[in-house]
């Protein structure tokens, strides 16, 4: 069964700046990735970025830089200033879609005892939906 992993890291240099990394563990061609915060989109979540392998990337504040790391993983850097900046317990969700076969989603947040800049290797987050 395909899985999605989500890793959230607070930058050591800017304590209110976050890096979110997400990846898809499975076969199949990913056609769209959506990153949201505050929960899944439509269930209280807000879209931060949409990444398409051919048509490009769209992102919304406070997202600063979204990019593909590999064909099946992405990263997103969030600005840390202003009213819309994330806090330590913010939930981030990544949805990987392969149209029309299905989509896979997982959410994660900053580990409670994590030191800024210290990150564990990515481990699969609980799958919220694997359709």
């Amino acid at each position: 069964t395909p899985e999605v992993w989500v890793q959230v890291r607070m930058e050591a240099t800017e304590l209110s700046s976050f890096t979110i990394r997400c990846g898809f563990l499975g076969s199949g061609s990913i056609s769209l990735v959506t990153v949201s915060w505050g929960g899944p989109n439509g269930a209280g979540g807000t879209t931060l970025a949409v990444l398409h392998p051919e048509r490009g990337i769209r992102q919304w504040a406070p997202a600063r830089q979204a990019r593909w790391e590999t064909q099946s993983s992405i990263s997103l850097i969030l600005e840390g200033s202003g009213a819309s900046s994330p806090c330590a317990n913010t939930t981030f969700c990544c949805k990987f879609a392969s149209f029309p076969e299905g989509s896979w989603e997982a959410c994660g947040s900053l580990p409670p005892s994590s030191d800024p800049g210290l990150s564990a290797p990515p481990t699969p987050a609980p799958i919220l939906r694997a359709d």
Epitope: L32, N41, G42, R55, R58, P100, E101, G102, D131
Partner: antibody, heavy 120, light 106 residues
Framework: EVQLVESGGGLVKPGGSLKLSCAAS????????MSWVRQTPAMRLESVAT????????YYPDTVKGRFTVSRDNAKNTLYLQMSSLRSEDTAIYYC?????????????WGQGTSVTVSS | QIVLTQSPAIMSASPGEKVTMTCSAS?????MFWYQQKPGSSPRLLIY???NLASGVPVRFSGSGSGTSYSLTISRLEAEDAATYYC?????????FGAGTKLDLK
């Protein structure tokens, strides 16, 4: 302006065949997944074929699998639906629709439809 | 395949009223869409991915929901909103539609 124009509908006997076409203009046709969706006399909407990845991957519901074939000619900006072994329950208006991936594959543009009647 | 059940099948409301229709899925869905269809016309996209308004759609339309329960709301009904509204999902193939909610104006 995005336009989708279907053609090829008509009256056909049960067991017969028909080929529908959808001429696309106003966008880069090869970049988009496309579907055929039909609307029955009872006004139900049913997706009958989807084509993605430049025509490599095609998808059909069980109701038409083995009888319908979707294809596309990106050079001609045209989508096709070859229908065979037609049944009375295939009577419907057939629409072609574009899927916009940045809209999460919503069908953001539809043609005007072409009517197919299967009757003896 | 996922079955979408729309309710009510038919509803009637007056201009200015707030109207809500629902779409219930037989299992959890990944992406939900809403379309409007007027007699003699093709369906028109209203809402994509549960709650996002398609281009040119008036802000009186809104969508919400998650999992198996979704809704479309028109905050202040206008005469031009008389139509049939369909929900549609894609989670895995096939893409499926609800049977529609026909909205008439009083």
């Amino acid at each position: 302006e995005v336009q989708l124009v279907e053609s090829g509908g008509g009256l056909v006997k049960p067991g017969g065949s028909l080929k529908l076409s959808c001429a696309a203009s106003g966008f880069t046709f090869s970049n988009f997944a496309m579907s055929w969706v039909r609307q029955t006399p009872a006004m139900r909407l049913e997706s009958v074929a989807t084509i993605v990845n430049g025509g490599i991957n095609t998808y059909y519901p069980d109701t038409v699998k083995g009888r319908f074939t979707v294809s596309r000619d990106n050079a001609k900006n045209t989508l096709y639906l070859q229908m065979s072994s037609l049944r009375s329950e295939d009577t419907a208006i057939y629409y072609c629709a574009r899927h916009d991936d940045f809209l999460y594959y919503a069908m953001d543009y539809w043609g005007q439809g072409t009517s197919v009647t299967v009757s003896s | 395949q996922i079955v979408l059940t729309q309710s009510p099948a038919i509803m009637s409301a007056s201009p200015g009223e707030k109207v809500t229709m629902t779409c219930s899925a037989s299992s959890s869905v990944s992406y939900m869409f809403w379309y409007q269809q007027k007699p003699g016309s093709s369906p028109r996209l209203l809402i994509y991915d549960t709650s996002n308004l398609a281009s040119g759609v008036p802000v009186r339309f809104s969508g919400s929901g998650s999992g198996t329960s979704y809704s479309l709301t028109i905050s202040r009904l206008e005469a031009e909103d008389a139509a049939t509204y369909y929900c549609q999902q894609w989670t895995s193939y096939p893409l499926t539609f609800g049977a529609g909610t026909k909205l008439d104006l009083k």
